[in-house]
């Protein structure tokens, strides 16, 4: 519905009786009268374009604000072309300025420029050129501005001329009201249009029967916009659970349909795996063996836990195991499947078993996995490990049974050492290595094998109990292939990668670290 206008000031309708203040008196703006169709037309005009430094003010009478919060100012005016005057009149302007001042009392003839705040510079869309002016074809411009929020009892408008040739024919000041309205199952009364501040222009609505404010929602309120039009509700009345909107009323859901909460949606048919509902139902109960998770919407079919993961494999790689599995064949009707991996280790000699979560390392946290693989490392050699992969979904917590699959694997080797070059010279290489701490107690010695690159006929071996060695008596500027292998009581562990390390050339001699 369009806004309703309430006029506070209408210069054109006042017939020259308003007696606005001009400053300086008589030398700038002045009231003029013209007769059109035997009716007097009044205007305020100024045209001191040939004189520089014009500062002419026209102030309205004091206007009582009443209930208005934002006012609209409609101006109708003419502006003459500066080229109508000799040499374009260097001091001539084609705009004027609009100001306002709020006050709780009428200052009468006490005019003070400093109390006024500029609203805008008013420029014409069309100027009146000489030929039009002399033919009495003046170009009438219409401009509108608004000001708000207003808080004092009343206000003045003022027009500042700085050297234009202007005639102000109409000044209309009004505010807007939003009309009475029934919308969104709420009734809104006629309301004064607000200012920019929404809290000053919001209006509470009254809900119709079986309509409510949704839980946690805001009261049904609409903004009465500055232009007197209602905007979209902030909050609204919605048909309560078990009811749907039919025209401007709320009607109970039919049997076999439901509506879970106060919302804009219509009643929905009961979903899969539910029992039929009575009239006005707010939900549909699940069939036996099917469930709803607390966060599931009532519109979702009832679901059940998944079956176990399908086809679990455990592949050993030194002191690591890669577990892979495929999703359950029955998802239970849900997509929120996650997997949990648990680990058990057993000593082959005693057969004693226990959890091993504290001693192993997973490639990602083993609970709430969404991918179907995980790598387990830091496994101890010569141990038997059993891994359990459980599939769960949003309703698994509602039943006591679990859906899982297990796989076992024996670890026979240590993890390969990680090798680093610590330093080098023309005739030596300093090498260090590391293996995971849980495996270190099982290592008897480390065996370092090295040979010249390209020489496959001979190689050298050094054994040490430590984690580093310096290889001496090497040829300068030569690349050597170096490998480190852990030796355990049971035999050889996994060997490291073969590394290529080069001694320094004679020119770059000296023991340089890398």
């Amino acid at each position: 519905a369009q806004g309703k206008e309430v006029v506070l000031l209408d210069f054109a309708a006042a017939g020259g009786e308003l007696g606005w203040l001009t400053h300086p008196y008589g030398k700038g703006w002045d009231l003029m009268q013209n007769i059109m169709n035997d009716m007097p037309i009044y205007m305020y005009s100024v045209c001191n374009v040939m004189s520089g430094d014009q500062d002419n003010w026209l102030r309205t009478n004091w206007v009582y604000r009443g209930e208005a919060e934002r006012i609209f100012i409609e101006l109708k005016f003419t502006v003459r072309d500066c080229n109508s005057f000799p040499g374009g009149a260097s001091s001539c302007k084609e705009t004027f300025n609009l100001y306002y001042a709020e006050s709780d009392l009428d200052y009468g003839t006490n005019f003070q420029k400093r109390l006024f705040t500029k609203i805008d510079t008013i420029a014409p869309d069309e100027i009146t050129v000489s030929s039009d002016f002399e033919a009495r074809h003046v170009k009438l411009n219409v401009e509108e501005r608004s000001v708000g929020p207003l808080t004092r009892k009343g206000f003045y408008l003022a027009f500042q001329d700085i050297g234009a040739c202007v005639a102000l024919l109409s000044v209309r000041v009004y505010y807007k009201k939003c009309p009475e309205l029934l919308q969104g199952l709420a009734h809104f009364p006629e309301t004064i249009a607000g200012s920019d501040a929404p809290s000053l222009a919001t209006v509470a609505g009254t809900c119709v029967d079986h309509a409510v404010v949704p839980p946690g929602g805001e009261e049904p309120r609409m903004h009465c916009a500055v232009d007197g039009e209602w905007l979209v509700p902030i909050g609204q009345c919605l048909c309560q659970a078990g009811y749907e909107k039919v025209e401007d009323a709320c009607q109970a859901c039919s049997p076999g349909f439901f509506k879970f909460e106060a919302s804009e949606s219509p009643c929905l048919e009961c979903p899969e795996h539910t029992l039929p509902s009575p009239e006005g139902a707010t939900s549909c109960e699940c069939e036996e063996g099917f469930f709803r998770a607390p966060q599931d919407p009532a519109s979702m079919p009832c679901t059940r836990p998944p079956s176990a993961p399908h086809y679990l494999t455990a592949v050993g790689m030194g002191a690591k195991v890669e577990l892979r599995w495929t999703p359950p064949q029955d998802s239970g009707g849900r997509e929120d499947i996650v997997y949990s991996v648990t680990c058990e280790q057993c000593w082959p000699e005693s057969g004693e078993c226990g959890p091993c979560e504290a001693s192993v390392r997973y490639s990602e946290p083993p609970h709430g996995l969404t991918r179907t693989s995980v790598t387990v490392s830091d496994l101890e050699p010569h141990m038997n490990y059993t891994f359990t992969v459980e599939a769960r979904n949003g309703v698994s917590g509602l039943v006591t049974s679990r859906s899982f699959r297990t796989a076992s694997v024996s670890i026979n080797q240590t993890e390969p050492p990680k090798v680093r070059l610590e330093g080098r010279s023309t005739t030596s290489l300093s090498v260090s290595w590391s293996i995971p701490p849980p495996q270190q107690s099982r290592v008897w010695k480390y065996e370092v094998t090295y040979r010249k690159k390209g020489d496959s006929n001979s190689y050298n071996v050094r054994r040490t109990e430590g984690f580093s060695v310096t290889l001496d008596d090497l040829a300068p500027d030569t690349t050597y292939l170096v490998q480190v292998q852990a030796l355990t009581q049971e035999g050889q562990g996994a060997g490291s990668k073969v590394h290529e390390f080069q001694t320094l050339s004679p020119e770059g001699s000296g023991n340089l670290a890398v």
């Epitope: 008196y25 030398k27 040939m50």
Partner: antibody
Framework: QVQLVQSGGGLVQPGGSLRLSCAAS????????MHWVRQAPGKGLEWVSV????????YYADSVKGRFTISRDNSKNTLYLQMNSLRAEDTAVYYC?????????????WGQGTLVTVSS | SELTQPPSVSVAPGQTVTITCQGD??????ASWYQQKPGTAPKLLIY???NRPSGVPDRFSGSSSGTSASLTITGAQAEDEADYYC????????????FGGGTKLTVL
């Protein structure tokens, strides 16, 4: 009947003073700007002074500035022109006139005129 | 800022006569025209674009162009013999309002 009736003219010596009055009737005196216009014998019209409706604004022609004072008493519907330091060139018929709109006219109602003669 | 009028103009009865008024202020503001007969106060004839107060015969009309304003009497009569003055707001800011020097119209 809308009219302006003037009084107070006469013969005065150079350097002397005189006060002219202009009594208004038939309209809302306090709503209009009022002017004094003079006409030297055998000459044209010369604007002298203006006063705003409430009496808070006044303007004077350069020839009388500092010597003449325009005033009004809206409770008595009367306009005044106090003339001091009169000179021979101030000799003229003085008219009061109403500005029909605004400050500067046009002058739609005129008094009958009163002669001021400055002579020794 | 001054307004300039011809000192005198004459017309035969029933003929049309035009009295002119020149001045820079007339680019900015309309002229008003006054008629003054001997021994009486001036009387408003024309103001604004071409407005006549009630009681003024329609043979009197006004017009303006650039720095010039004109009073035209179409079908002059003996009783129109009088002095005619133009008047305008002063756009220079020197004065508030200015009068022309007056034109004596003689109806032959």
């Amino acid at each position: 009947q809308v009219q302006l009736v003037q009084s107070g003219g006469g013969l005065v010596q150079p350097g002397g003073s005189l006060r002219l009055s202009c009594a208004a009737s038939g309209f809302t005196f306090s709503s209009y700007a009022m002017h004094w216009v003079r006409q030297a014998p055998g000459k044209g019209l010369e604007w002298v002074s203006v006063i705003s409706p409430a009496g808070n604004n006044t303007y004077y022609a350069d020839s009388v500035k500092g010597r003449f004072t325009i005033s009004r008493d809206n409770s008595k519907n009367t306009l005044y022109l106090q003339m001091n330091s009169l000179r021979a060139e101030d000799t003229a018929v003085y008219y009061c006139a109403r500005a029909s709109v605004g400050a500067t006219g046009p002058f739609d109602i005129w008094g009958q005129g009163t002669l001021v003669t400055v002579s020794s | 800022s001054e307004l300039t009028q011809p000192p005198s103009v004459s017309v035969a009865p029933g003929q049309t006569v035009t009295i002119t008024c020149q001045g820079d202020s007339l680019r900015s503001y309309y002229a008003s025209w006054y008629q003054q007969k001997p021994g009486t106060a001036p009387k408003l004839l024309i103001y604004g674009e071409n407005n006549r107060p009630s009681g003024v015969p329609d043979r009197f009309s006004g017009s303006s162009s650039g720095t010039s304003a004109s009073l035209t009497i179409t079908g002059a009569q003996a009783e129109d013999e009088a002095d005619y003055y133009c008047n305008s707001r002063d756009s220079s800011g020197t004065h508030l309002t200015v009068f022309g020097g007056g034109t004596k119209l003689t109806v032959l």
